[in-house]
């Protein structure tokens, strides 16, 4: 069971990143699915290595003082959302903006029907060029 | 099937990074090989988690305006090269240069004879000290 | 065999990071253990994907000129410690400090009784908020 999906620019104002099965994507079988273009949902309980990579372009003067933060979040059936991983990068002083990449990854127990998704502080700063921003998992 | 190879400084002007089976490297068996010191080639079709880490030292004034970009690329038999993953970091203002690390990783389907390699915008900026820059894969 | 442990602030002056089985941690079975809150020790020989993520907050003026470096280290029975992976990030000019995240990961052969741990140049700069700093492994 494995998946690797590719970032998709979205007109939605939500902080949850959007993904698509496009380019050189992976969707090994129907035991993992991309739902509503925003979350990877697994049908089997077990340990999964889950990862995300986010490239963004921001400028210190044009952004809030808070850093750019990417969060990997989990929603299990009958449970509240929770944060699995976060990474933070302070905005660049480069103009018009400076690109930076964040990589998140870890091993987590997922229940049947559990979904994972990626949240960012400012989705408008995310880079969607080939290979820059992606999200995936693999069952151990 | 798994491999982990270590960066090697090169006098070549190519943007493709060079690697070696040295230090604490991994080469599980002959189903994965390091070819010409530049690419990992697999003999078996399947899903692989492929990763690279690149540490570099650059300075904004001494570098081009474009960021430092590391790309994980795929060459399948009878197919054109394609980019699987990219990460970008704007150059530091630290002098003489500021070190930064990039990590790339994702799950991809590889065909028999497929090769993966790592490209960077400026190989002269890459750090080759122990553990700083490495490249590997594992078959799921 | 898999583990994922969560960073713990420590009053110790050591450069070795401290970890805990708290929050959404993983400890698959007793073939991997967290020892003294500082190292993951495995009982079985084999290939492991080992990873660490460290988020830190530093300022160029308040820090030494040297970058912030995170190192993944190995101690095998009867052998000296060795560095498996390192990543470096130059300190930010943001005030009071600028957050940055480092991700390390690679495939390594571990012997029975081998331990892996994470070293940083300045543990006081490490961020311990939910999901920021973690450490884990999985057996292939």
């Amino acid at each position: 069971i494995a998946a690797h999906v590719i970032s998709e620019a979205s007109s939605k104002t939500t902080s949850v990143l959007q993904w698509a099965e496009k380019g050189y994507y992976t969707m090994s079988n129907n035991l993992v699915t991309l739902e509503n273009g925003k979350q990877l949902t697994v049908k089997r309980q077990g340990l999964y290595y889950i990862y995300a990579q986010v490239t963004f372009c921001s400028n210190r003067e044009a952004s809030s003082q808070a850093p750019f933060i990417a969060s990997l979040c989990l929603k299990s059936p009958g449970r509240f959302e929770r944060i699995l991983l976060r990474a933070a990068n302070t905005h660049s002083s480069a103009k018009p903006c400076g690109q930076q990449s964040i990589h998140l990854g870890g091993v987590f127990e997922l229940q049947p029907g559990a979904s994972v998704f990626v949240n960012v502080t400012d989705p408008s700063q995310v880079s969607h060029g080939t290979g820059f921003t992606s999200f995936g998992l693999l069952k151990l | 099937i798994a491999a982990h190879v270590i960066s090697e400084a090169s006098s070549k002007t190519t943007s493709v990074l060079q690697w070696a089976e040295k230090g604490y490297y991994t080469m599980s068996n002959n189903l994965v090989t390091l070819e010409n010191g530049k690419q990992l080639t697999v003999k078996r079709q399947g899903l692989y988690y492929i990763y690279a880490q690149v540490t570099f030292c650059s300075n904004r004034e001494a570098s081009s305006q474009a960021p430092f970009i590391a790309s994980l690329c795929l060459k399948s038999p009878g197919r054109f090269e394609r980019i699987l993953l990219r990460a970008a970091n704007t150059h530091s203002s630290a002098k003489p240069c500021g070190q930064q690390s990039i990590h790339l990783g994702g799950v991809f389907e590889l065909q028999p004879g497929a090769s993966v390699f790592v490209n960077v915008t400026d190989p002269s900026q890459v750090s080759h000290g122990t553990g700083f820059t490495s490249f590997g894969l594992l078959k799921l | 065999i898999a583990a994922h442990v969560i960073s713990e602030a420590s009053s110790k002056t050591t450069s070795v990071l401290q970890w805990a089985e708290k929050g959404y941690y993983t400890m698959s079975n007793n073939l991997v253990t967290l020892e003294n809150g500082k190292q993951l020790t495995v009982k079985r020989q084999g290939l492991y994907y080992i990873y660490a993520q460290v988020t830190f907050c530093s300022n160029r003026e308040a820090s030494s000129q040297a970058p912030f470096i995170a190192s993944l280290c190995l101690k095998s029975p009867g052998r000296f410690e060795r560095i498996l992976l390192r990543a470096a990030n130059t300190h930010s000019s943001a005030k009071p400090c600028g957050q940055q995240s480092i991700h390390l990961g690679g495939v390594f052969e571990l012997q029975p009784g081998a331990s892996v741990f994470v070293n940083v140049t300045d543990p006081s700069q490490v961020s311990h908020g939910t999901g920021f700093t973690s450490f884990g492994l999985l057996k292939l």
Epitope: I69, S71, R79, F80, R82 | - | G23, S127, G129, T130
Partner: nanobody
Amino acid sequence: EVQLLESGGGLVQPGGSLRLSCAASGFTFSDYEMMWVRQAPGKGLEWVSTITSDGISTYYADSVKGRFTIFRDNSKNTLYLQMNSLRAEDTAVYYCAKSGRFFDYWGQGTLVTVSS
């Protein structure tokens, strides 16, 4: 034993504001992400907002984004929810909650009624 005690609810007119508080005990508050959830009359539990242990990251349901603000004071072991521009559809019992490894904990709740 984990204890979460909410307060600050009441009757408020549409467009008004309220600040909810949650006093936590029985665990190391500063180690945990915390959240607010709510249950409208006759409906299921709905997640409202989450804040990380360090207070740096906050997350909101789309229905409250821009109107509600979650914050915490780790020195006082207290979680807050500032609710502005309240609407009739915000009427609910609000619960402070903590994620455990295997299940979630929440308090007794405080009732918020938005009505003219």
